[in-house]
């Protein structure tokens, strides 16, 4: 769009001020030192110009910087950075919060973009793992960025950075993505007491084995339906009606409207029919009385 | 998702100032935008921009308006407000708050519009 | 009279193919970014293309910008009947220091 093209007689910018919203973009490009734009990025948001007009202005700062800005710079560009794309991120090197803080502001009305993306993986591989203030840092702009990490990457999350996870993060984590982040919550709330270990841990139960279930059904904890559903199917299957019925407490007539869904609907037919008569609740589907079970999955293991 | 919404008196008359606001949702108005436009259109007629107010308090003005607009951004309430004086019959439109997108110049969100009349 | 210039009216069938002009000067299209807009009867304007020939998310690929020197045009193709709405096209224009608009076009699906 910009064509060289030599600078009018006392157009030359002799600083970044708001006079320049008046150049045309040949005029700015013309007319705007390279030098002179670095070292006064920080004036750039202050001057109303329009995206075009940052679209000269990255440009001269691509001349200046073939090979990739200096944290100096990205840490100044404000909305410039909207500019940016995923190849020009890949040559940065972004080392402080302060400058990732400040480049996901000026993105948050938008959604997330594969450049905001590039620079979050940036960030994250240049410190080697997501500490706990990253993490902090990107959940609170993008409250779904735990569950758009693969099973690989959240591995390299340490359990001290669960602290920073509110159970919003999780919405959309997957089963798989869950078993990473259970057993790192474990450990990192393993000194809590019960009700608030509980508190803390239920938005990770998707992860949870039946041996933890059964632990947590011993403790009071009236699971409410909504986590209950979230559970791994196969961690809910060997679970008795007595240790379901301990795990919802006063939430477990909630089982009935959910009688016809996953785990529910697989959990009633592994049960005793007379044990579900229990319950008092109407659930049907279990085993008829004087019928044997075999569980083949423990005959095949013995073989 | 960011929404606008205008809100004003439907009916003026000559002389008067208009005076509009858009309140945003979903977002903060000092954060979610680089910056915040203000567009019109006579009924029937054709669109006209009537000014943009940056995340900063910035302002840019159609220079046939300039004399008698005035914008601002009220943080604290998250909206933007428009002050048109000395209105006249060729002031009547429907008023539009708009939002550019990330990193380009076209309004990609829009207000629904309010329809401001101008009559004696 | 407006700064960009478009024909009034434009008309195709079901599956046709149209396209919209928008004529301007070396101050605002020759220079600058042109951003199409649709506007269905009664709503708030839609924008369909920006930076000439861009798309944003959601916008289906039925849809195209171009420019060449100080004209640009919009393209619709698989002409569908819901495409039928006001045509806006709009640059930033140097010596007016602002945005600019066409006047529109209505495009009517026969």
């Known amino acids: 769009e910009v064509e060289k093209t030599a600078c009018p007689s006392g157009k030359k910018a002799r600083e970044i001020d708001e006079s320049l919203i008046f150049y045309k973009k040949w005029e700015l490009e013309a007319c705007v030192d390279a030098a002179l734009l670095a070292t006064q990025m920080d004036r750039v948001n202050a001057i109303p110009f329009t995206y075009e007009q940052l679209d000269v202005l990255k440009h001269k700062l691509d001349e200046l910087y073939p090979q990739g800005y200096p944290e100096s710079v990205i840490q100044h560009l404000g909305y410039l950075f909207l500019k940016m794309s995923p190849e020009d991120i890949r040559k940065w090197n972004v080392t402080s919060l302060e400058t990732l803080k400040a480049l996901l502001e000026v993105n948050k009305g938008h959604e997330m973009s594969p450049q905001v993306a590039t620079l979050i993986d940036r960030f994250v591989k240049g410190r080697g793992q997501l500490d706990k203030d990253t993490l902090d840092t990107l959940t609170a702009f993008y409250p779904g960025y735990l569950c758009s990490l693969s099973p690989e990457e959240l591995s390299s999350v340490p359990p001290s950075s669960i602290w920073a996870v509110r159970p919003q993060d999780l919405d959309t984590c997957d089963p798989r993505q869950l078993d990473v982040l259970y057993p790192k919550a474990r450990l990192a709330f393993q000194n809590m007491n019960g009700s608030e270990y509980f508190v803390k841990i239920q938005s990770f139960l998707g992860g949870a084995p039946t041996e933890d279930l059964k632990a947590l059904s011993q403790q009071n904890v009236s699971m409410d339906l909504a986590t209950f559903m979230k559970l791994r199917t196969d961690a809910v299957l060997p679970l008795t009606v007595a240790e379901v019925q301990k795990l919802l407490g006063p939430h477990v007539e909630g089982l009935k409207a959910e009688e016809r869904h996953r785990p529910v609907r697989d959990w009633i037919l592994r049960q005793r029919q007379d044990d579900l008569d229990t319950l008092g609740l109407g659930l049907q589907g279990g085993i008829p009385n004087g019928y044997l079970v075999l569980d083949l999955s423990m005959q095949e293991a013995l073989s | 998702q960011v929404q606008l919404q205008e809100s004003g008196p439907g009916l003026l008359k000559p002389s008067e100032t208009l005076s509009l606001t858009c309140t945003v949702s979903?977002?903060?108005?000092?954060?979610?935008?680089?910056?915040w436009g203000w567009i019109r259109q006579p009924p029937g007629k054709c669109l006209e921009w009537i000014g943009s107010?940056?995340?900063?308090?910035?302002?840019r003005y159609n220079p046939s308006l300039r004399s008698r607009v005035t914008t601002s951004l009220d943080a604290s309430k998250n909206r933007l407000s428009l002050q048109l004086s000395s209105v006249t019959a060729a002031d009547t439109a429907v008023y539009y708050c708009?939002?550019?997108?990330?990193?380009?110049?076209?309004?990609?969100?829009w207000g629904q519009g309010t329809m401001v009349t101008v009559s004696s | 009279q407006s700064v960009l210039t478009q024909p009034p009216s434009a008309s195709g069938t079901p599956g046709q193919r149209v396209t919209i002009s928008c004529s301007g000067s070396?101050?605002?299209?020759?220079?600058?970014?042109v951003y199409w807009y649709q506007q269905l009867p009664g709503t708030a304007p839609k924008l369909l293309i920006y930076?000439?020939?861009k798309r944003p998310s959601g916008i289906p690929d039925r849809f195209s910008g171009s420019k060449s020197g100080t004209s640009a045009s919009l393209a619709i193709s698989g002409l569908r009947s819901e495409d039928e709405a006001d045509y806006y096209c709009?640059?930033?224009?140097?010596?007016?220091?602002?945005?600019?608009f066409g006047c529109g076009t209505k495009l009517t699906v026969l």
């Open positions: 708009a939002r550019p997108g990330a990193g380009h110049d076209g309004f990609d969100i």
């Open positions: 979903g977002g903060s108005i000092s954060s979610s935008s680089y910056y």
């Open positions: 107010i940056y995340y900063s308090g910035t302002t």
């Open positions: 070396s101050s605002n299209i020759g220079s600058n970014y």
């Open positions: 930076d000439n020939n």
């Open positions: 709009a640059a930033w224009d140097d010596s007016l220091s602002g945005w600019v």
